[in-house]
């Protein structure tokens, strides 16, 4: 099966790398515009220059292209705790990230929220916090892991998964309850 190509990909594949096919004349290959620029006018003929223009401040193109407009610079989402790592330039979009000792939690492919890395109180760090992953903790005896925090086994209910980890404590609690009945 031949993969379906979009019109633009089909047009580009006819020309050598770095060129695109003239939209009005498929016998002409025009040179693509450098990143940081956009297409103002197609080349008038073979071997003639494409009319590319510089992106305005606040916009960019990050690869060679034949776009009619530059792309708007992204804004970091403050409500998601994001901070600006590097500002937008005409050839590169804004780079957003998280503060020190925070990690990115992706809600979708392009949307992330910053959360504080777990400190592993009442436990030890099994895997350090990384850019896109929280710390992985191992809990001390008498504690179990809940939402990546070490919680005392005294908070373990019989029906929960923690019963395996907190078995001795559960037995003690059960024994105390039984001895109290007549």
């Amino acid at each position: 099966l031949v993969p379906h190509l979009g019109d633009r990909e089909k047009r580009d594949s006819v020309c050598p790398q770095g060129k695109y096919i003239h939209p009005q004349n498929n016998s002409i290959c025009c040179t693509k515009c450098h990143k940081g620029t956009y297409l103002y006018n197609d080349c008038p003929g073979p071997g003639q220059d494409t009319d590319c223009r510089e992106c305005e401040s606040g916009s960019f193109t990050a690869s060679e292209n034949h776009l009619r407009h530059c792309l708007s610079c992204s804004k970091c989402r403050k409500e998601m705790g994001q901070v600006e790592i590097s500002s937008c330039t005409v050839d590169r979009d804004t780079v957003c990230g998280c503060r020190k000792n925070q990690y990115r939690h992706y809600w979708s492919e392009n949307l992330f929220q910053c959360f504080n890395c777990s400190l592993c109180l009442n436990g030890t760090v099994h895997l350090s916090c990384q850019e896109k992953q929280n710390t992985v903790c191992t809990c001390h005896a008498g504690f179990f892991l809940r939402e990546n925090e070490c919680v005392s086994c005294s908070n373990c209910k019989k029906s929960l998964e923690c019963t395996k980890l907190c078995l001795p404590q559960i037995e003690n609690v059960k024994g105390t309850e039984d001895s109290g009945t007549t």
């Epitope: 450098h34 940081g36 620029t37 590319c52 500002s87 937008c88 330039t89 005409v90 050839d91």
Partner: nanobody, 114 residues
């Protein structure tokens, strides 16, 4: 207003080296690619080398391996280190903001004698 000022041109023997500088002012230098063009007598102005904001570069085939473009954002300056110069490198060398903008320097003459 945007200003670009080249320096460092001169007369050099074939096989020699020169370093051109271009100091920029009037815009946020680190936000723009920069380039060097040259124009030999009776010829069209041609792109020699370009450098993007992330430091990535491109070169004309005729200068690859001999010329190196670099930038110093702290000094608002772009450089062109030219080595193994040939008589055919003789031209006026111009600095330009990006590769297509209307902003050019005045040019600096480079003459390579055989």
């Amino acid at each position: 207003q945007v200003q670009l000022q080249e320096s460092g041109g001169g007369l050099v023997q074939s096989g020699g080296s020169l370093r051109l500088s271009c100091r920029a002012s009037g815009f946020t230098f680190s936000h723009y690619p920069m380039s060097w063009y040259r124009q030999a007598p009776g010829k069209k102005r041609e792109l020699v080398a370009g450098i993007y904001t992330d430091g990535s570069t491109n070169y004309a085939d005729s200068v690859k391996g001999r010329f190196t473009i670099s930038r110093d954002n702290a000094k608002n300056t772009v450089y062109l280190q030219m080595s193994s110069l040939k008589p055919e490198d003789t031209a006026v060398y111009y600095c330009r903001r990006s590769m297509v903008s209307v902003y050019w320097g005045q040019g600096t003459q480079v003459t390579v004698s055989s």
